[in-house]
Amino acid sequence: QSPIFGPQDVSSIEGNSVSITCYYPDTSVNRHTRKYWCRQGANGYCATLISSNGYLSKEYSGRASLINFPENSTFVINIAHLTQEDTGSYKCGLGTTNRGLFFDVSLEVSQVPEFPNDTHVYTKDIGRTVTIECRFKEGNAHSKKSLCKKRGEACEVVIDSTEYVDPSYKDRAILFMKGTSRDIFYVNISHLIPSDAGLYVCQAGEGPSADKNNADLQVLEPEPELLYKDLRSSVTFECDLGREVANDAKYLCRKNKETCDVIINTLGKRDPAFEGRILLTPRDDNGRFSVLITGLRKEDAGHYQCGAHSSGLPQEGWPVQAWQLFVNEESTIPNSRSVVKGVTGGSVAIVCPYNPKESSSLKYWCHWEADENGRCPVLVGTQALVQEGYEGRLALFDQPGSGAYTVILNQLTTQDSGFYWCLTDGDSRWRTTIELQVAEATKKPDLEVTPQNATAVIGETFTISCHYPCKFYSQEKYWCKWSNDGCHILPSHDEGARQSSVSCDQSSQIVSMTLNPVKKEDEGWYWCGVKEGQVYGETTAIYVAVEERTRGSPHINPTDANARAKDAPEEEAMESSVREDENKANLDPRLFADEREIQNAGDQAQENRASGNAGSAGGQSGSSK
């Protein structure tokens, strides 16, 4: 007996699709070996139609897929647009040849069933409305009209022209005639449910002279659309329920035994398990809407249904659309932190992965808001201005080719706590959700800037210092000037290889920045930060105000400022001495290369006079040049 298991008999009708699930023993070899679906020929040979190696036969082109689910020890063969030619004997199996482990499957595709000539077939989806047409001769124009449903030999009246309505059709069935028509009446049955399916007879008149019509009503359960998504990726359920429910509340629910638990609806209900990672977006006025779920988890797999009803809850007899979501644990999306913690006044650096094949895509960072259907307004992007309220404290650093970009948010407050999304205009699967938790600070921040009230005077030299603890000793220190399109790292001179230090004096660790001479355009936010390669760490921000020299204020010449810098604790000198010819070069603000490259490339004019002094405790006194 074969250890592979599946359905022995599969039957369907022309035009439909089937999903055949084959189960295999849970072993490492089985999980990774080739899976196949082949058709058994009369000669005993089994011709491969599709395999997990990527093979797809001509007759299955565009209508079949084979997907392996190693975590469930199953693989699924989906075949659409069935024809009677697909009827036959097949094998689903494992192994490098089609003679390995397999299971025999018989597929039978029938024609759409035919009924007697006088039977009209009506095929409708659950929740929809059917209009049954009943013709009669003029002699029965004034006779009683009725519609009954066949139950065995009996035919039970559903509705008639004397205003009788069967209780199970109450408020759902109406009998009417259109305009001046004298030979036809109609019966509408709305909010169709599965038990409405069956054979109906409509009748005008009584006895042998009565006119009768047969109607076969088929009420279709929604065929779930199969969605295969990777762990940590995102899924969008596109729901189009039709104009008749355009004004009703919409919902997405997840089937759980016989109930369907609402995940989100347009009345403000939302399942806490999806907090921070779900959005419901109306698409148009015809009732179309979509639900996006990011950060997919293993437990998100299951049967989903969207629908509409004034209550915002599932109701029998209302239109629905269905999906089966599979979550593949062998994901291409890297595992990143789902919770990032910060403290008030501090900063966070959030790494956002994106598809490395799409390094030129636009990157964004948005704040998920819980109100109503959930929304995610963009706070910053590679070509998006920083949102009001985030000036000077939010920047996006793209790292082309690394498959990630970094978002830094500083000057944190407890109001910054919440959910944020990383997204690009490229591969929509790569949307990640981060929960930011900001707690009250219990100690001084790691980076401190002095002076804290920074006011620079035009034409003079201005220096601000950033004190850092010994734990950042080996990391790269930088100053950058914040602008609406990022924080542009200021040029510096390479001080040469820094001496390694055995001891570290906590008080002497300083990186300073000097503006010489100060200009009006130097006003703005400056950040002091640490990083290791492309991994950004802590940052702190300071606003430098620039004012005109007031009459009588002493003029400090640059040498005095430098002398003062010499008296300061040992520093890593990052002094500006950019040559005049470098002023003409412009750096693309979207490039965040390391400081040496930026210096070589030249810099934006207003940043050329700014420099930072990075001090070392290794006995190398920093001095301005």
Epitope: F5, P7, Q8, D9, V10, S11, S12, I13, N16, S17, V18, S19, I20, T21, Y23, T74, I126, I193, P194, S195, L220, E221, P222, E223, P224, K255, N256, K257, E258, G302, H303, E316, Q324, F326
Partner: nanobody, 126 residues
Framework: QVQLVESGGGLVQPGGSLRLSCAAS????????MGWFRQAPGKEREFVTA??????????YYADSVKGRFTISRDNARNTVYLQMNSLKPEDTAVYYC?????????????????WGQGTLVTVSS
Amino acid sequence: QVQLVESGGGLVQPGGSLRLSCAASGRTSSISTMGWFRQAPGKEREFVTAIRWSGSSSYKYYADSVKGRFTISRDNARNTVYLQMNSLKPEDTAVYYCAAQMSLWRDPREIDYDYWGQGTLVTVSS
């Protein structure tokens, strides 16, 4: 809730036939799979057969021990599933249980079905 009621069990001679019925009531529109399991005295409950449906497609599953002898079928209008048992053997003697599952994607052989009937006894003996 879904209620399941089995019928059709009884005493039959080896080589004989029997037809079991399982009528479902309640929220039957949520059911996607119905199966038959059996439990012989002193043994664990085992999978016999199942039928799964989605739209107008159906999928029938059989245990190796009953393949070719037992047939499962479904009457959609009556919300009933039938088990036609031919060429019965003494080892088929057991209490036969009908079960219903709401998920299309769980392994039909597993006993983690959502609803179960009370069972009907089938005895194959001469």
